[in-house]
């Protein structure tokens, strides 16, 4: 799990030999004396491999912990296998000409040796107690101390591949997965939104007049809002299409129903790439000497903690998450409709939360382990959450969609915006997720807009 492998120079050789060991039929074409179709199609039974010089002979593979010294002389005769020397191993039956070099745990990454290398098993590297693995790539991890959630509570405990998820006490805000006092909140930072209610409350106690005026203001405000709401209903269709073109840069929305497949496709990993960072004398450690790491397939909670906060027109961007990210994959970061648009000519209020596509995009991009917290913050009760989960039975995605639909139905149209969702995501230190949502809805940059999601 997250182990280092062989040095770069050995990798092509190792890959070839592994290929020979695991997929003999797929490698026959690489053997000089075997050319025609019939020979290539001949396959030995399990546990045996084709003799490289004579495809009519099947030799027995070597056991794990050993390597091939000499091929078997003939049918039914033993293969000459030798035990791996110290510092090398083979973890499965094979016909490798050399054993694989044992991995070394990366001290500079804080890794410790969980178990030593033996002839039939590679070194197992891990982290110390109260540390988690931050994966920079599929096979490269670094150890970091778990957050203690001082001035807050542990929402999700620290796990092997994920930092603690903290919820801060009142008067504190989350910054780099630590609860920081609101007294450290500068006006230019996003924390002003989190710390504002507290400041307002203090002012409220000083001025008793507000207690009388506030309900009146709210009452008249609601009346005004309802009038505006009715007026907007009439202009709704026109407004919606204009909004779409502003947010997604597309003139006319296409028909609904093209929801899936709009997010960015990951690049195909380079098959020749060595997943092992190598050392170079001048530059020190090279995280990836050639090209690519494939990403781990599991989705980890906190995958997009406040990775790329929106740039404000005046204030500098708020940087929230830890450089190594509070996630399993050390993982986050896309443009969102929450920020004040950089192009001052276009300042949309929201994306349309009436559109199923918007809600599905939210479902897809909020980390599953943070979902309940997310909908609770939107105002759904545990009872409602449980009821909707039961109603939708096995389909979690539909249950999550129903939760958002419930929230949208009960929230006034002007308030049920992606901006509100964005504020909640920001409070949860998941602002990067909002970028993912917009990328899902509007398509990635430098590509033609994705199929329209908004009607």
């Amino acid at each position: 799990m997250g182990l280092s492998t062989v040095p770069d120079l050995l990798l092509p050789l190792v890959l070839l030999e592994l290929l020979v060991g695991i997929y003999p039929s797929g490698v026959i074409g690489l053997v000089p004396h075997l050319g025609d179709r019939e020979k290539r199609d001949s396959v030995c039974p399990q546990g045996k491999y084709i003799h490289p010089q004579n495809n009519s002979i099947c030799c027995t593979k070597c056991h794990k912990g050993t390597y091939l010294y000499n091929d078997c002389p003939g049918p039914g005769q033993d293969t000459d296998c030798r035990e791996c020397e110290s510092g090398s191993f083979t973890a499965s039956e094979n016909h490798l000409r050399h054993c694989l070099s044992c991995s070394k745990c990366r001290k500079e990454m804080g890794q410790v040796e969980i178990s030593s290398c033996t002839v039939d098993r590679d070194t197992v590297c891990g982290c110390r107690k109260n540390q988690y693995r931050h994966y920079w790539s599929e096979n490269l991890f670094q150890c970091f101390n778990c957050s203690l959630c001082l001035n807050g509570t542990v929402h999700l405990s620290c796990q092997e591949k994920q930092n603690t998820v903290c919820t801060c006490h009142a008067g504190f805000f989350l910054r780099e997965n630590e609860c920081v006092s609101c007294s450290n909140c500068k006006k230019s930072l996003e924390c002003t939104k989190l710390c504002l209610p507290q400041i307002e409350n203090v002012k409220g106690t000083e001025d008793s007049g507000t207690t009388v005026l506030l309900p009146l203001v709210i009452f008249f405000g609601l009346c005004l809002l309802s009038l505006l709401f009715i007026g907007l209903m009439y202009r709704y269709q026109r407004w919606k299409s204009k909004l779409y073109s502003i947010v997604c840069g597309k003139s006319t929305p296409e028909k609904e129903g093209e929801l899936e497949g709009t997010t960015t496709k990951p690049l195909a990993p380079n098959p020749s790439f060595s997943p092992t960072p190598g050392f170079t004398p001048t530059l020190g450690f090279s995280p990836v000497p050639s090209s690519t790491f494939t990403s781990s397939s599991t989705y980890t909670p906190g995958d997009c903690p406040n990775f790329a906060a929106p740039r404000r027109e005046v204030a500098p961007p708020y940087q929230g998450a830890d450089p190594i990210l509070a996630t399993a994959l050390a993982s986050d970061p896309i443009p969102n409709p929450l920020q004040k648009w950089e192009d001052s000519a276009h300042k949309p209020q929201s994306l349309d939360t009436d559109d199923p596509a918007t809600l599905y995009a939210v479902v897809e991009n909020v980390p599953p382990l943070r979902w309940k917290e997310f909908v609770r913050r939107l105002g759904l009760s545990d009872h409602e959450i449980d009821r909707l989960e039961l109603q939708n039975g096995r389909c979690l995605r539909e249950a999550q969609y129903s939760m958002l639909a419930t929230w949208r139905r009960r929230t006034p149209r002007r308030e049920a915006t992606l901006e509100l969702l964005g504020r909640v995501l920001r409070d949860m230190d998941l602002l990067g997720c909002l970028e993912d949502i917009e990328e899902a809805l509007c398509g990635p940059a430098a590509l033609p807009p994705a199929p329209s999601l908004l009607r």
Partner: nanobody, 118 residues
Amino acid sequence: EVQLLESGGGLVQPGGSLRLSCAASGFTFSYRMGWVRQAPGKGLEWVSSISSRGRHTSYADSVKGRFTISRDNSKNTLYLQMNSLRAEDTAVYYCAKRVPGRGRSFDYWGQGTLVTVS
């Protein structure tokens, strides 16, 4: 073939400036990108990231206010403007393409460019 090629590193005095560039090829330059550095004998440290359209940027506390990340999608190039450089900024700087949906994890990296502040 995917390639990320960094340039612009070198020796600079404390307080000086450098501009790193990263030329991308072999893939559509429409993903979030980032810079990660590694000081001699230390682990990797995330430095900065930028969203696909360049609207959103994020920085490590250690470089905030001094470094600026930007991109030119028409040129398939990522930049890191480094001002007020300090000795502790000495590191190999890697340009990397982020794995979609995976936060600060990257699936393509450059070879790195060495920045020495001395």
